[in-house]
């Protein structure tokens, strides 16, 4: 006769491990008992359970409620046992010893491998600002047994580097993603991908990139000279910029206070019916937590009664 078993049994933490041990013998042979033991290099051989043809399943008190026989129907030659709710400490070598009559004893050893799936965590790096050099965007850490694989999935150009720390029963892997921040990266996803044999599918954690920047400011509204004549209504100057965080806008007049009736509404300066007093140099001041920008324009309101005068539009930043 011979024993049918496995060299390695692999289970995920918390699952039940079936330790297989089947005696393939002649029809007239009987299995008297199957003794299961844990083989520890330090503690030696310690009995786990014993299946006896007459007295049934005996379980070591240290494994009470954790060792069972597989559900019926059972073959009398099947000495397999179930180890419930596998934990990391169960990982190791097991021995099955089958006593048969009249053939004698047979034994086999197998290794139980308990996979510990990782629970990854993603930590964003310091605030990203346009103009910085190579900067940490995020780091991702996952600990498991065996060591998990940690990679990045993103359209953003950058570099990744990994390091691992080995513990007695697991390994922690940390991967960092570095990039040179630019405004085009704003809102782009950066996804940490963790692979592990104990996971049915990869675990993914996504971080949305935020890069602080402030664009140059410019002013629109002076393109149509006909709008800037005495008496015209609806004349506006609009300050153009963009940034992250979104910028605030402030309007001033360089050569004095804003004329009465001129309304400031965010990025837009609205004028009442135009008079020559609205001529002057207007400054748009744009700022966010990162920086500030100015753009100024010179407005000259033309009096139609004075045909010798043209509207002089000068823009400077």
């Amino acid at each position: 006769g011979e024993l049918e078993t496995s060299d390695v049994v692999t289970v995920v933490l918390g699952q039940d491990a079936k330790l297989p041990c089947f005696y393939r013998g002649d029809p007239d042979e009987q299995v008297g008992q199957v003794a299961w033991a844990r083989v520890d290099p330090n503690e030696g051989i310690r009995e786990l359970a014993l299946l006896h043809s007459k007295y049934g399943l005996h379980v070591n008190p240290a494994y009470e409620d954790r060792v069972e026989q597989p559900p019926p129907p059972r073959d009398p030659l099947d000495g397999s046992v179930l180890l419930r709710n596998a934990v990391q400490a169960d990982e190791g070598e097991y021995e099955c010893r089958v006593s048969t009559f009249p053939a004698g004893s047979f034994q086999a050893r197998m290794r139980l491998r308990v996979l510990v799936p990782p629970l990854p965590s993603l930590n964003p790096g310091p605030p990203l600002e346009e103009g910085q050099g190579l900067t940490l965007a995020a780091s991702c850490t996952a600990e498991g047994s065996p060591a998990p694989s940690v990679t990045w999935d993103t359209e953003v150009k950058g570099t990744q580097s990994s390091r691992s720390f080995t513990h007695p029963r697991s390994a922690a892997v940390t991967s960092e993603f570095h990039l040179v921040p630019s405004r085009s990266m704003n809102g782009q996803p950066l996804t940490c991908v963790v692979s592990h044999p104990g996971l049915l599918q990869d675990r993914r954690i996504t971080h949305t990139l935020q890069v602080a920047f402030l664009a140059e400011a410019s002013v629109r509204g002076l393109e149509d000279q006909n709008l800037w004549q005495v008496g015209r209504e609806g004349a506006t100057l609009k300050c153009l910029s963009e940034g992250q965080p979104p910028p605030k806008y402030n309007w001033t007049r360089l050569d004095g206070p804003l004329p009465s009736g001129v309304r400031v509404k965010g990025d837009t300066l609205g004028f009442p019916p135009l008079t020559t007093e609205h001529s002057g140099v207007y400054v748009c001041h744009v700022s966010n937590e990162l920086s500030s920008r100015d753009s100024q324009v010179t407005v000259e309101v033309l009096d139609p009664e004075d045909p010798g005068k043209q509207v002089d539009l000068v823009s400077a930043s």
Epitope: Q33, A35, E47, A49, L50, H52, K54, N60, P61, S99
Partner: nanobody, 118 residues
Framework: EVQLVESGGGLVQAGGSLRLSCAAS????????MGWYRQAPGKQREYVAT???????NYADSVRGRFTISRDNAEDTVYLQMNSLKPEDTAVYYC????????????WGRGTQVTVSS
């Protein structure tokens, strides 16, 4: 030949405790499984509990949680700690031991009487 001698039986009130012992005469062969059966008047012999040399145990459902079997391999002695005794536990308790050589051979003790009064 292995001889088994039980002791510790007696009369006890319901809810009380007793501890049975069974000593095996020294054998050149190691005893594999040792344990206890019982037989109430007019009934068949009934399995109670057994223990292996490695300390693994098995119990009948009727005594699980109340009785505890233990063993001293060096002395070839088996014990049965019986707590929360009930009148239906009244029986003659027999020690059993199995010796494995070319095949399993089972030995029995003469028994010790346990009476639980209500």
């Amino acid at each position: 030949e292995v001889q088994l001698v039980e002791s510790g039986g007696g009369l006890v009130q319901a809810g009380g405790s007793l501890r049975l012992s069974c000593a095996a005469s020294r054998s050149t062969f190691s005893l594999n499984i040792m344990g206890w059966y019982r037989q109430a008047p007019g009934k068949q012999r009934e399995y109670v509990a057994t223990i292996t040399t490695g300390g693994s145990t098995n119990y009948a459902d009727s005594v699980r949680g109340r009785f505890t079997i233990s063993r001293d391999n060096a002395e070839d002695t088996v014990y049965l700690q019986m707590n929360s005794l009930k009148p239906e536990d009244t029986a003659v308790y027999y020690c059993t031991a199995e010796l494995v050589r070319r095949g399993p051979t089972t030995y029995w003790g003469r028994g010790t009487q346990v009476t639980v009064s209500s």
